[in-house]
């Protein structure tokens, strides 16, 4: 039975050219995390496997850094980075847990004027 829950940073905004940490946390379970997949809509950004360690997609390796922990740091953000990100926790013996983060990258001038992404 899956008893765990995934907590994420939820809906976040960041400035163009800046950086952001995508973070998920699995709680309320003693299951062993065997692998975490970080996905952005249709592509795989990175995996962190308990036996193999981190592998980052070459398309993102200049802008993506592993960590902290099982999280992912995105750097040199562009407006094209806006969208949904998913952390997929593969665990033993529970199975798979998925968390969702929505990132909006704002133009610097917009960010400076205090605009922030919100879901009513």
């Amino acid at each position: 039975m899956m008893t765990g829950t995934i907590e994420t940073t939820g809906n976040i905004s960041a400035e163009k050219g800046g950086s952001i940490i995508l973070q998920c946390h699995l709680s309320s379970t003693t299951a062993q995390v065997t692998q975490v997949n970080w996905e952005q809509q249709d592509q795989l950004l990175a995996i962190c496997n308990a036996d193999l360690g981190w592998h980052i997609s070459p398309s993102f390796k200049d802008r993506v850094a592993p960590g902290p922990g099982l999280g992912l740091t995105l750097q040199s953000l562009t407006v094209n980075d806006t969208g949904e990100y998913f952390c997929i926790y593969h665990t033993y013996p529970d199975g798979t847990y998925t968390g969702r983060i929505f990132l909006e990258v704002l133009e610097s001038s917009v960010a400076e004027h205090g605009a922030r992404f919100q879901i009513p």
Epitope: Q35, N37, E39, D42, L44, N49, A50, D51, Y92
Partner: nanobody, 118 residues
């Protein structure tokens, strides 16, 4: 116990192609976190090549991107590595690995030898 069996290796001339297969047998699982290909040349460390998730998302090493293609047939519990434009430096033992969702550890195949002659 799950076993991974690679096949398709052999001797090929530079510029040629090979398709490797990795079949999972035994107590197979309904889904996997990833299945991937690695290689090890004599006297060198194991090198990551490509990974595919059960959602068919892929990730490649810089050294093979554009030349190698990973794919999977989930109905057959098999993952493939299509290798094109092979070079002598691609000579190595090629290993398949899988992280099944409901498995505690990574599973490795026994390897298949690929030799690229110039």
């Amino acid at each position: 116990e799950v076993q991974l069996v690679e096949s398709g290796g052999g001797l090929v001339q530079a510029g040629g192609s090979l398709r490797l297969s990795c079949a999972a047998s035994g107590r197979t699982f309904s889904s996997y976190a990833m299945m991937g290909w690695f290689r090890q040349a004599p006297g060198k460390e194991r090198e990551f090549l490509a990974i595919i998730t059960d959602g068919s998302k892929t990730l490649y090493a810089d050294s093979v991107k554009g030349r190698f293609t990973i794919s999977a047939d989930n109905a057959k519990n098999t993952v493939y590595l299509q290798m094109n434009s092979l070079k002598p430096e691609d000579t190595a033992v090629y290993y398949c690995a899988a992280q099944f969702t409901l498995a505690r550890h990574l599973v490795w195949g026994q390897g298949t030898q690929v030799t690229v002659s110039s």
